[in-house]
Amino acid sequence: CDLPQTHSLGNRRALILLAQMGRISHFSCLKDRYDFGFPQEVFDGNQFQKAQAISAFHEMIQQTFNLFSTKDSSAAWDETLLDKFYIELFQQLNDLEACVTQEVGVEEIALMNEDSILAVRKYFQRITLYLMGKKYSPCAWEVVRAEIMRSFSFSTNLQKGLRRKD
């Protein structure tokens, strides 16, 4: 499956929207930095099969959608930007779903990618626990926004690599 160019553009648009969502001066949030333990190895195209990497991307976008769809998230961010962000994520989920099912049979996906999906879920669990611990403070959301931007950037670069391998 060749990830469409539109998916890459969508990813870039999502990153731009994330960048625009900042509401407070992030310089005041330095002490709130946290090690979320991004599961980089899950997205390593050399170690894993293409279908597994795509499946991990899918899970990351799904979890990002879930994270930013909460009541607490809606209170933290600009509604218009958030709606645009949802649309980009939804489009990417559709692209990736088509790609994963094309790579392997649907019934094989769950088993084959269980570990990588679990690693992504645990990563987002750590993010959610951090936000809860910080009582969803503006700085906690800023730190999470920066973290999601970094993980998106990382996966975007890997998607470019996957397209080149084709």
Epitope: A19, G22, S25, H26, F27, L30, K31, A146
Partner: antibody, heavy 121, light 107 residues
Amino acid sequence: EVQLVQSGAEVKKPGESLKISCKGSGYSFTSYWIGWVRQMPGKGLEWMGIIDPSDSDTAYSPSFQGQVTISADKSISTAYLQWSSLKASDTAMYYCARHPGLNWAPDFDYWGQGTLVTVSS
Amino acid sequence: DIQMTQSPSSLSASVGDRVTITCRASQSIDEFLNWYQQKPGKAPKLLIYFASSLQSGVPSRFSGSGSGTDFTLTISSLQPEDFATYYCQQAHSFPLTFGQGTKVEIK
């Protein structure tokens, strides 16, 4: 390969203006902040301020607030440090360094080679 | 502002010695502390970040410890290339501040 390349040494007279630069390459320039550090002859390191090139938001040390201006042009991956009126006490080596922002990653992991600014009448 | 105080300001040691430099913050900075090495005419080089994480490419003889207000940089066995000035820097909040430096000289 990540690199921060600073502009060359400058010799200026008191009262003159100056703008020095720091060009980043080998990484996503807008994903990191750029900090500026002063080192006067034979002295220690002093943090001056920082900029987020993605939105040009800045923060300054109170000691340098109003004395210098930090800016960036993300289209050419370059950060700047400028003075509108130099003083003899501005004579120092100035370093730029990249900072991971709010991400959990090493602070100031890459530094420019430094720009020596000499202010003398 | 958070003040950073390093001690000693200078020390003399021999190759193979174990060297310890301490850094104290004027208020708690959790583990937001970095250590840098600077040689004459060169830019500083990051050694340790977040109090105890070894920066990529830095020899394992360098280690950092501490949290809150008291921190330590240890060089387990001093090598000829380690003679330099070392700075601690708090990364907890702006304005970022450095210690005054510790110069490690040859005995």
